[in-house]
């Protein structure tokens, strides 16, 4: 796969993953009421990172935000933090990768700079994906623990108004947001890895510049404004080249062996 394609695909995959991380973070269905083996209730409960909701059989849905920070479980706070860190890193990764894309020309940025930026964005995407996966997994683990705890004492005594009240404990299971988060985190991670792989292809390789020969007939030596000679060698790069008027930028028809001066 060519460097441009690998980089572009990595960017797109990361972008889709990043969008998924945002979606998962905002979704209300991180945990949903377990309906299996429970009396059929006309009320369905589900919870997100930011609010909990109740949907009645009548069709009315009521959501209440968690308007406290101190009263929330530490694990929930940790999951929130991980998801937000993942989003922030993803935003930075996207901004960096836009400038790093090989198909976008910005000023006189050479490939070594683009390679560094591609690597940076790749690492940011990898960390972003890992944050999302860890966040979702921590929440899932919390759910599993609570599920089995509430299963152990399915019918618990609960102090209500005027003594002991028999209550069927509401058990929660994995909501759609967890699956969205896992997939999104995985995609962001894969996209980041692809960006890092693309970075290796962008890094200038000394072997490409050992022999410099000229394709021009006669003394027609093309100079770049900076004074560097254009590498149009016959060696390993004997493919059709296009000579551009405005300096000696050459561009491969297939971008498998980019040269140092492919893009200004």
């Amino acid at each position: 796969m060519s460097v441009t394609a690998c980089q572009g695909l990595g960017f797109v995959v990361s972008l889709i993953g990043f969008a998924g991380i945002i979606a998962a973070t905002c979704m209300d269905q991180w945990s949903t009421q377990d309906l299996y083996n429970n009396p059929v209730t006309a009320v369905f409960n589900y919870q997100g990172l930011w609010r909990s909701c109740v949907r009645e059989s009548s069709g009315f849905t009521e959501c209440r935000g968690y308007f406290t920070l101190l009263g929330l479980p530490a694990m929930l706070q940790a999951v929130r933090a991980l998801m937000i860190v993942g989003i922030v890193l993803g935003v930075i990764g996207i901004l960096v990768s836009i400038f790093a894309l090989k198909c976008i020309r910005i000023g006189s940025m050479d490939d070594s700079a683009k390679a560094k930026m591609t690597l940076t964005s790749g690492i940011l995407f990898i960390i972003s994906g890992i944050c999302a996966i860890i966040g979702v997994s921590v929440f899932a683990n919390m759910l599993v623990t609570n599920f089995w705890m509430s299963t152990a004492n399915m019918y618990s005594g609960m102090g209500g108004m005027g003594g002991m009240v028999q209550t069927v404990q509401t058990r929660y299971t994995f909501g759609a947001a967890l699956f969205v988060g896992w997939v999104a985190g995985g995609l962001t991670l894969i996209g980041g890895v692809m960006m890092c792989i693309a970075c290796r292809g962008l890094t200038p390789d000394d072997s490409n510049f050992k022999a410099v020969s000229y394709h021009a007939s006669g003394q027609n030596v093309a100079y770049r404004p900076g004074g560097f000679k254009a590498s149009t060698g016959f060696g390993s790069n004997t493919r059709n080249k296009k000579i551009y008027d405005g300096g000696a930028r050459t561009e491969d028809d297939e971008q498998s062996h980019p040269t140092k001066y492919d893009y200004v």
């Epitope: 009421q33 009396p39 059929v40 209730t41 006309a42 009320v43 409960n45 589900y46 919870q47 909990s52 909701c53 109740v54 009645e56 059989s57 009548s58 069709g59 009315f60 009521e62 209440r64 609960m158 209500g160 009240v165 028999q166 209550t167 069927v168 404990q169 509401t170």
Partner: antibody, heavy 118, light 113 residues
Framework: QIQLQQSGAELARPRASVKLSCKAS????????ISWVKQRPGQGLEWIGE????????YYNENFKGKATLTADKSSSTAYMELRSLTSEDSAVYFC???????????WGQGTLVTVSA | DIVMTQSPSSLTVTAREKVTMNCKST????????????LTWYQQKPGQPPKLLIY???TRESGVPDRFTGSGSGTDFTLTISSVQAEDLAVYYC?????????FGGGTKLEIK
């Protein structure tokens, strides 16, 4: 103003079937849930089931499965309940009611009296 | 099915008297998700359909006089009429609105002396 208009009284033979209607007006019928409630003369209230008119889903009281069939026609904003294999036990007033907050029934039809007699 | 038990089955009171009727369910009607009790109170006058008085155990329906008050949580609920009026002559039903199938209590018949 929200109204539920039910069909007129029915006199039916044992083992026959009747189809009761409940026409809704004054609100968007398709986004609502309509329940049916039975009340035998001088007795209490019994919930038969409910129709989710937006998706056609229905929930039945197990005691009425096989006895009542709930349907709805969105175009005419009308809910239907068919009662089959009628016996004297089915002689009652049948109400339709619209679900409200807390799964309560805020709006009721005037009731349809079904009399099963040989 | 959830069984709703109402007591007393009938009450005879004088006008402007305070009345209390009870409703007990076999399982808690409290939903942990929103901390609301899914219990409803209805008033049914002779020859009429039931009328919604209270939902969520204590929320008064709009248009219902404030002399009607619902209270209780879990399995034990109460409907209080602070000052009975002649027009309050009716049968009062409580309803489980939490578990399928929805079930009603047997009713409390309120009579005025």
């Amino acid at each position: 103003q929200i109204q539920l208009q039910q069909s007129g009284a029915e006199l039916a033979r044992p083992r026959a079937s009747v189809k009761l209607s409940c026409k809704a007006s004054g609100y968007t019928f398709t986004s609502d849930v309509i329940s049916w409630v039975k009340q035998r003369p001088g007795q209490g209230l019994e919930w038969i089931g409910e129709s989710y008119l937006r998706n056609g889903n229905t929930y039945y009281n197990e005691n009425f499965k096989g006895k009542a069939t709930l349907t709805a026609d969105k175009s005419s904003s009308t809910a239907y309940m068919e009662l089959r294999s009628l016996t004297s036990e089915d002689s009652a007033v049948y109400f339709c009611a619209r679900s409200y907050y807390g799964n309560s029934f805020a709006y009721w039809g005037q009731g349809t009296l079904v009399t099963v007699s040989a | 099915d959830i069984v709703m038990t109402q007591s007393p089955s009938s009450l005879t009171v004088t006008a402007r008297e305070k009345v209390t009727m009870n409703c007990k369910s076999t399982q808690s009607l409290l939903n942990s998700g929103n901390q609301k009790n899914y219990l409803t109170w209805y008033q049914q006058k002779p020859g009429q359909p039931p009328k919604l008085l209270i939902y969520w155990a204590s929320t008064r329906e709009s248009g219902v006089p404030d002399r009607f008050t619902g209270s209780g949580s879990g399995t034990d609920f109460t409907l209080t009429i602070s000052s009975v009026q002649a027009e309050d002559l009716a049968v009062y039903y409580c309803q489980n609105a939490y578990y399928y199938p929805f079930t009603f209590g047997g009713g409390t018949k309120l009579e005025i002396k």
